[in-house]
């Protein structure tokens, strides 16, 4: 099943996708579409790239903000709404016969948590480190936040929590 990414309404969603250009700098076309990857191309295309640059966007909210020329074709959706929820297809159109790499990811857009005057430690910890999600008979799924998390003290946790909230970073759950 698709990896899930969670973003709050009004924040930016980040859906990772990448490939390694071989040789370096030898870019391949990529499409992002709403809906699972079909047989070829993408359905409901939101963004396309060619061998040089982004050449088609259906809205100014869709961006590739990573190092596109190194194969980072992660999609950023700005100012997400509940309607942005759903499965997205990242298709890396590697030249050849049926060579494409297909990645389906699921974006879950949630309403912002109610603001309380004095957030508790528990709430901040949950924001920084999302709760484990139960996935049927397989038990709790792995959860991650963007980047790696070394040993941190409580002060660092509060700082990280605020940075995540300010940046609108998307939380990933498997």
């Amino acid at each position: 099943s698709e990896v899930e990414y969670i973003a709050e309404v009004g924040q930016n969603a980040y859906l990772p996708c990448s490939y390694t250009p071989a040789p370096p700098g030898n870019l391949v076309p990529v499409c992002w579409g709403k809906g699972a990857c079909p047989v070829f191309d993408c359905s409901n295309v939101v963004l396309r790239t060619d061998n040089r640059d982004v050449n088609d966007r259906t809205s100014g909210r869709y961006w590739l903000k990573g190092d596109f020329h190194k194969g980072d074709v992660s999609l950023t959706i700005e100012n997400v709404t509940l309607a942005d929820s759903g499965v997205y297809c990242c298709r890396i159109q590697i030249p050849g016969i049926m060579n494409d790499e297909k990645h389906n990811v699921k974006l879950v857009v949630i309403k912002p948590a109610k603001v309380t005057p004095a957030p508790t430690l528990q709430r901040d910890l949950t924001s920084a480190f999302p709760r484990m999600l139960t996935t049927g008979e397989h038990g709790p799924a792995e959860t991650q936040t963007p980047g790696s998390l070394p040993d941190v003290n409580l002060t660092q946790i509060f700082t990280l929590t605020n940075e995540l909230r300010d940046s609108g970073a998307t939380i990933r759950t498997a």
């Epitope: 079909p38 359905s43 049926m98």
Partner: antibody
Framework: EVQLVESGGGLVQPGGSLRLSCAAS????????WSWVRRAPGKGLEWVSA????????YYADSVKGRFTISRDNSKNTLYLQMNSLRAEDTAVYYC?????????????WGQGTLVTVSS | EIVLTQSPATLSLSPGERATLSCRAS??????LAWYQQKPGQAPRLLIY???NRATGIPASFSGSGSGTDFTLTISRLEPEDFAVYYC?????????FGGGTKVEIK
């Protein structure tokens, strides 16, 4: 107005070759994936092959894999199908078909078709 | 490959009547299903895509529904020009496949 005009069909002997062309006009050719679809006499529609907007990625039905090659020339707004090692069962009307504007593997415009007859 | 079974093979109706055409997939195709109309000597014409979206220029009398394995094309009121062969096509799994067609003929 979108126009798709196929050419290159005809009578060919088993084992022979043909090259079909599809000239397109009326829209931005490079953005869309394209396909060839055929209809054999008395039968239904069969998808044959597809090519991505860039032309780098190609897709084939098992029945033609290794014998047919799809290609496109974006500068000429033209789609091609090179058909080698033709068999009697390849006899059909061949249509070029444009993929949907926002992707998806349905076909929103079709040519009128060109007849390929494989017979000795 | 996914097999699409269309029923009935032939539908005999009069102008003004309602036509209901069925397409059943051998496994789920989500909502990745399209419907086409084809008349003798003509190219197919896209009617419906993504199971329920009407293509540009298609009259409101045509509607599509369903998801997963069972799909329906409905023509609410048959006009003389609607008598033709109708095909469904799935694009959720390789290879793309079409149904065998339903012929809607004048009774």
């Amino acid at each position: 107005e979108v126009q798709l005009v196929e050419s290159g069909g005809g009578l060919v002997q088993p084992g022979g070759s043909l090259r079909l062309s599809c000239a397109a006009s009326g829209f931005t050719f490079r953005q869309n994936a394209w396909s060839w679809v055929r209809r054999a006499p008395g039968k239904g529609l069969e998808w044959v092959s597809a090519i991505s907007g860039s032309g780098g990625s190609t897709y084939y039905a098992d029945s033609v894999k290794g014998r047919f090659t799809i290609s496109r020339d974006n500068s000429k707004n033209t789609l091609y199908l090179q058909m080698n090692s033709l068999r009697a069962e390849d006899t059909a009307v061949y249509y070029c078909a444009k993929g949907g504007d926002y992707g998806g593997n349905y076909f929103d415009y079709w040519g009128q078709g060109t007849l390929v007859t494989v017979s000795s | 490959e996914i097999v699409l079974t269309q029923s009935p093979a032939t539908l005999s109706l009069s102008p003004g009547e309602r036509a209901t055409l069925s397409c059943r997939a051998s496994q789920s195709v989500s909502s990745y299903l399209a419907w086409y109309q084809q008349k003798p000597g003509q190219a197919p014409r896209l009617l419906i895509y993504d199971a329920s979206n009407r293509a540009t220029g298609i009259p409101a009398s045509f509607s599509g529904s369903g998801s997963g394995t069972d799909f329906t094309l409905t023509i609410s009121r048959l006009e003389p020009e609607d008598f033709a062969v109708y095909y469904c096509q799935q694009y959720g799994s390789s290879p793309l496949t079409f149904g065998g067609g339903t012929k809607v003929e004048i009774k």
